[in-house]
């Protein structure tokens, strides 16, 4: 953890080092004041590597609903609508933080968890495996 | 929030409804047991809509380092390496949860925050705006 100067106005903490258990306010502050507010909502269909979004729901997790992208094809879509299999559609993945209820079903106790989610797909030049 | 049966083994909580302030264990559990373990690490370069990754650091945030993707071109890269401006490179964005120290500099008190990050880029067919 990063050493941070302790502020006298902070809530009490037994451990003065980087904490293992912390208090988290769940009133989410939304910082999405993007200078490019165009949502990615239609990219999944317009992309040369189109994808579908699947709902992943887990009441023991916060957020309970996460949308997972699945690439529609192994190849990439050409201008004429046909699939070009000399190119590959691949998922763009990101590791995100979620809160997992621990112990299970407890409303006010969580553990931080890292999960890998697929956000969308991109079209890449294939890896050529050369046979010796 | 979702109504969850309260477990007698849960830590004490004043509020029996969905909590506003919760305890979070920061010992991160990593769930990345994917059946498709191929990392996205080289996609940024092989993509027809390549991107660069920029480091965004904030000691008041957890995680303190987030990598932001910026598309290299407005168009998409063709097989010959030239850029095709009849297609558009666009960022795939995702809303993620982070922990923001609140009050500032406090080591054990956070607020949940939603931020929009660009994870990578994809190549899309442009929207054609017809002039009346």
């Amino acid at each position: 953890g990063i050493a941070i100067p302790r502020n006298s106005g902070c809530p009490n903490s037994e451990d003065k080092n980087f904490p293992r258990t912390v208090m988290v306010n769940l009133n989410i502050h939304n910082r999405n004041t993007s200078t490019n507010p165009k949502r990615s909502s239609d990219y999944y269909n317009r992309s040369t590597s189109p994808w579908n979004l699947h709902r992943n729901e887990d009441p023991e997790r916060y957020p309970s609903v996460i949308w997972e992208a699945k690439c529609r094809h192994l190849g990439c879509v050409k201008a004429d609508g046909n699939v070009d299999y000399h190119m590959n559609s691949v998922p763009i993945q990101q590791e995100i933080l979620v809160l997992r209820r621990e112990p299970r079903h407890c409303p006010n106790s969580f553990r931080l968890e890292k999960i890998l989610v697929s956000v969308g797909c991109t079209c890449v030049t294939p890896i050529v495996h050369h046979v010796a | 929030g979702i109504a969850i049966p309260r477990n007698s083994g849960c830590p004490n909580s004043e509020d029996k409804n969905f909590p506003r302030t919760v305890m979070v264990n920061l010992n991160i559990h990593n769930r990345n047991t994917s059946t498709n373990p191929k990392r996205s690490s080289d996609y940024y370069n092989r993509s027809t809509s390549p991107w660069n990754l920029h480091r965004n650091e904030d000691p008041e945030r957890y995680p303190s380092v987030i990598w932001e993707a910026k598309c290299r071109h407005l168009g998409c890269v063709k097989a010959d390496g030239n850029v095709d401006y009849h297609m558009n490179s666009v960022p795939i964005q995702q809303e993620i949860l982070v922990l923001r120290r609140e009050p500032r500099h406090c080591p054990n008190s956070f607020r949940l925050e939603k931020i929009l990050v660009s994870v990578g880029c994809t190549c899309v067919t442009p929207i054609v705006h017809h002039v009346a």
Epitope: N45, N52, L53, H54, R55, N56, E68, A69, K70, C71, R72, H73, L74, G75, V83, Y85, N88, S89, V90, P91, Q93, S118, C121, V124, P126, I127, V128, H129 | T33, S34, T35, N36, K38
Partner: antibody, heavy 124, light 113 residues
Framework: QVELRESGPGLVQPSQTLSLTCTVS????????VSWIRQPPGKGLEWMGI???????DYNSAFKSRLTISRDTSKSQVFLKMNSLQTEDTAMYFC??????????????????WGQGASVTVSS | DIVMTQSPSSLAVSIGETVTLNCKSS????????????LAWYQHKSGQSPKLLVY???TRQSGVPDRFMGSGSGTDFTLTISSVQAEDLAIYYC?????????FGAGTKLELK
């Protein structure tokens, strides 16, 4: 348990439109994709098209101009409409659920549950 | 379209025998990004709906007995049924799900000697 059931007319006149319904149970359409496959008498299986979990479709180009797949999620039904039928469209028509694999980041075109099939004869 | 060629078209077997069914694709079904082969095997018994046995060449679908074993890579694939049982008598189809349209082989009919 997962079940798919095809229904529709057994006999269709040439040049007319075929309408088939696939009623599903044991899974939800917003979670799974459904494909249509047919098998002409004495021949192999032929994939016709798919309706994805989000309602989008993809078709075998051999049928593209005359095939439409749609659905009604509230009734758990998937529909196949194919116009300009000819005698060579006589076949057993199956609907099938496309396999869903968690933590696998591609749509799946393997079918893990099939209906019993609807026999369609095109004849005057 | 990708052509899937199955051989033999029919096979007469005795109960307890081990049999090999072949499937050849006109193009490679190996996806370079994840090293998976996009090939499945189905069993179709008369009067019933087809049943998925194996996908990704060798992954058995849940509930499928381990006497069914898929193998191969690229363009050549086999389904081996060790110690054939009476309930295994059916038509077996291979299917590729790499290229659209997703195509099937003509089938191999497994019958009793």
């Amino acid at each position: 348990q997962v079940e798919l059931r095809e229904s529709g007319p057994g006999l269709v006149q040439p040049s007319q439109t075929l309408s088939l319904t696939c009623t599903v149970s044991g899974f939800s359409l917003p979670s799974h994709s459904v494909s249509w496959i047919r098998q002409p008498p004495g021949k192999g299986l032929e994939w016709m098209g798919i309706i994805w979990n989000n309602g989008g479709t993809d078709y075998n180009s051999a049928f593209k101009s005359r095939l439409t797949i749609s659905r009604d999620t509230s009734k758990s039904q998937v529909f196949l409409k194919m116009n300009s039928l000819q005698t060579e469209d006589t076949a057993m028509y199956f609907c099938a659920r496309n396999m869903y694999i968690t933590d696998y980041y591609y749509e799946n075109y393997f079918m893990d549950a099939w209906g019993q099939g609807a026999s369609v004869t095109v004849s005057s | 379209d990708i052509v899937m060629t199955q051989s033999p078209s029919s096979l007469a077997v005795s109960i307890g025998e081990t049999v090999t069914l072949n499937c050849k694709s006109s193009q490679s079904l190996l996806f370079s990004e994840n090293q998976k082969n996009y090939l499945a095997w189905y069993q179709h018994k008369s009067g019933q709906s087809p049943k998925l046995l194996v996908y990704w060449t060798s992954t058995r679908q849940s509930g499928v007995p381990d006497r069914f074993m898929g193998s191969g890579s690229g363009t050549d694939f086999t389904l081996t049924i060790s110690s054939v049982q009476a309930e295994d008598l059916a038509i077996y189809y291979c299917q590729q799900s790499y290229y659209t349209p997703y195509t099937f082989g003509a089938g191999t009919k497994l019958e009793l000697k």
